[in-house]
């Protein structure tokens, strides 16, 4: 029944209490005011309302705050946070780390990764800084979430998070995301040297610019061909034969097996034949 019914006389509540459990759904829809709910979220969470009833309350709150919930309400959501979608959260404006931490506690162990990501993203967007508790909460979420943040949000992620990123965590990241994450990784690993540095930075190399790759070639990284193939074509094609030689080190011979495939083929096309000949691998540009 989609027709909006009027609230029966005397049924309009002044407080949130157990009596509301016995209201029919249409009565809740007609009688309960969104601002009443917003002011008494602690009671909404305390009283054992059904999932359906809670859905009606959410609908009422959404109608009261069409531009997104105010932070005063968000802070009080408690377990009601579980009924909020990532799309809802994206409309919020959260500035307090306390608000974030309160909701993170609620979401713990609840399979709410998407909501947590959206919440942290919206906090970052408002200029928030990630404290230890927030970072700890993010630790429990697969790091592919980094690709779900907007590029602007990524800037606010502390470089320390880069230490946790695994080999395939960034597979669905856009080029722009990877570029930002590469810079963060460089900053995170700046005090790491030699082979350990390369092992760490390797995951992020899809975001390395031509200049980054040239700089990397100065550090004896001995890049394997599998990693080389994941580099941006645009970054790769501008590298000289000497730079690629320094980048690959002892793996330079593996170019031969990949010469007909992108990005090796694209790189070969941009080189002078005499320079390729100097490698002694029989590569054709």
């Amino acid at each position: 029944d989609t027709e909006q019914k009027a609230c029966p006389p005397g049924k309009e509540p002044n407080v949130v209490d157990e009596n509301l459990i016995f209201y029919q759904n249409w009565e809740l829809e007609a009688c309960v005011d969104g601002t009443l709910l917003a002011g008494q979220m602690d009671l909404v969470n305390e009283i054992p309302f059904t999932y359906e009833q809670l859905s009606i309350f959410k609908h009422k709150l959404d109608k009261t705050y069409p531009q997104g919930y105010p932070e005063s309400l968000i802070k009080q959501l408690g377990h009601f946070f579980r009924y909020v979608s990532p799309e809802d959260i994206r409309q919020w404006n959260v500035t307090s780390p306390d608000t974030v931490n309160t909701l993170l506690k609620v979401s713990k162990g609840q399979k709410m990764d998407a909501q947590v990501i959206a919440l942290v993203a919206c906090y970052l967007r408002g200029g928030g800084k990630l404290d230890e508790d927030i970072v700890k909460a993010l630790d429990n979420i697969p790091l592919s979430y980094l690709c779900d943040f907007s590029p602007q949000d990524l800037h606010a992620i502390p470089s320390s998070v880069m230490w946790l990123v695994g080999l395939h965590d960034l597979d669905k990241c856009s080029q722009r995301h990877l570029g930002i994450l590469y810079q963060k990784a460089c900053s995170a690993f700046q005090n790491v040297s030699g082979l350990e540095y390369f092992e760490k930075i390797r995951t992020f190399l899809g975001g390395a610019s031509r200049e980054d790759l040239r700089a990397l070639s100065q550090h004896n990284v001995s890049m394997d061909i599998a990693t080389f193939k994941k580099l941006q074509v645009d970054a790769l094609v501008g590298l000289s034969v000497a730079e690629v030689q320094k980048l690959l080190g002892p793996h330079i011979g593996d170019l031969k097996t990949e010469e007909d495939k992108s990005p090796v083929r694209d790189w070969l096309f941009r080189q002078q034949q005499k320079d390729l000949d100097s490698l002694g691998l029989g590569l054709q540009g």
Epitope: E211, N220, S240, K246, P250
Partner: antibody, heavy 117, light 107 residues
Framework: EVQLVESGGGLVQPGGSLRLSCAAS????????MSWVRQAPGKGLEWVAT????????YYPDSVKGRFTISRDNSKNTLYLQMNSLRAEDTAVYYC??????????WGQGTLVTVSS | DIQMTQSPSSLSASVGDRVTITCRAS??????LNWYQQKPGKAPKLLIY???RLHSGVPSRFSGSGSGTDFTLTISSLQPEDFATYYC?????????FGQGTKVEIK
């Protein structure tokens, strides 16, 4: 034809500063790492600084770190070396060189810097 | 830092002679060894890179060999224009370092 022309050398007192310039032509300047290499009178060659093609990365040996700053202006095809807190042992001919991966493939004619009171 | 040691420091030879200059690195530099030629009052010029590859325009009488720590520059038949000082340089590891030079003089 690749051409590198250094300028800005001269006599400077110990503790003083000097800025060298290197005008590049005959190649796409913004595509290459660039370096400064020096040679004290009657002595061998010493690498002084390298800068990445976009200017993001810079490299120095310990002997000049913190005193010398390499920079570049790709819109002017020019490389710079700002030298501060100069010492007598910095007296040398300073060469600007194009760097490719692991070697210096083209060099300028050099500019003499003399540090003396 | 990697130390580069050239020998001899100087040598006297005649036109047509075969000349060999050696360069030793204090640690393994793979094949990232380059040779430069410098004439008095002039800038150095790249002769050979990656141990044995001739830079463009360099005559074939120049050749290089070696690997790891020991390297050689050979001039098969010395010409009048080859009298100069020769420097080796390692490009394997920062900081890049040069040998002290070998002066090739006319006997």
């Amino acid at each position: 034809e690749v051409q590198l022309v250094e300028s800005g050398g001269g006599l400077v007192q110990p503790g003083g500063s000097l800025r060298l310039s290197c005008a590049a032509s005959g190649f796409t300047f913004s595509d290459y790492f660039m370096s400064w290499v020096r040679q004290a009178p009657g002595k061998g060659l010493e690498w002084v600084a390298t800068i990445s093609n976009g200017g993001t990365y810079t490299y120095y040996p310990d002997s000049v770190k913190g005193r010398f700053t390499i920079s570049r202006d790709n819109s002017k095809n020019t490389l710079y070396l700002q030298m501060n807190s100069l010492r007598a042992e910095d007296t040398a001919v300073y060469y600007c060189a194009r760097f490719d991966g692991y070697y210096f493939d083209y060099w300028g004619q050099g500019t003499l810097v003399t540090v003396s009171s | 830092d990697i130390q580069m040691t050239q020998s001899p420091s100087s040598l006297s030879a005649s036109v047509g002679d075969r000349v060999t200059i050696t360069c030793r690195a204090s640690q393994d530099i793979s094949n990232y060894l380059n040779w430069y030629q410098q004439k008095p009052g002039k800038a150095p010029k790249l002769l050979i890179y990656y141990t044995s590859r001739l830079h463009s325009g360099v005559p074939s009488r120049f050749s290089g060999s070696g690997s790891g720590t020991d390297f050689t520059l050979t001039i098969s038949s010395l010409q009048p224009e080859d009298f100069a000082t020769y420097y080796c340089q390692q490009g394997n590891t920062l900081p890049y370092t040069f040998g002290q030079g070998t002066k090739v003089e006319i006997k």
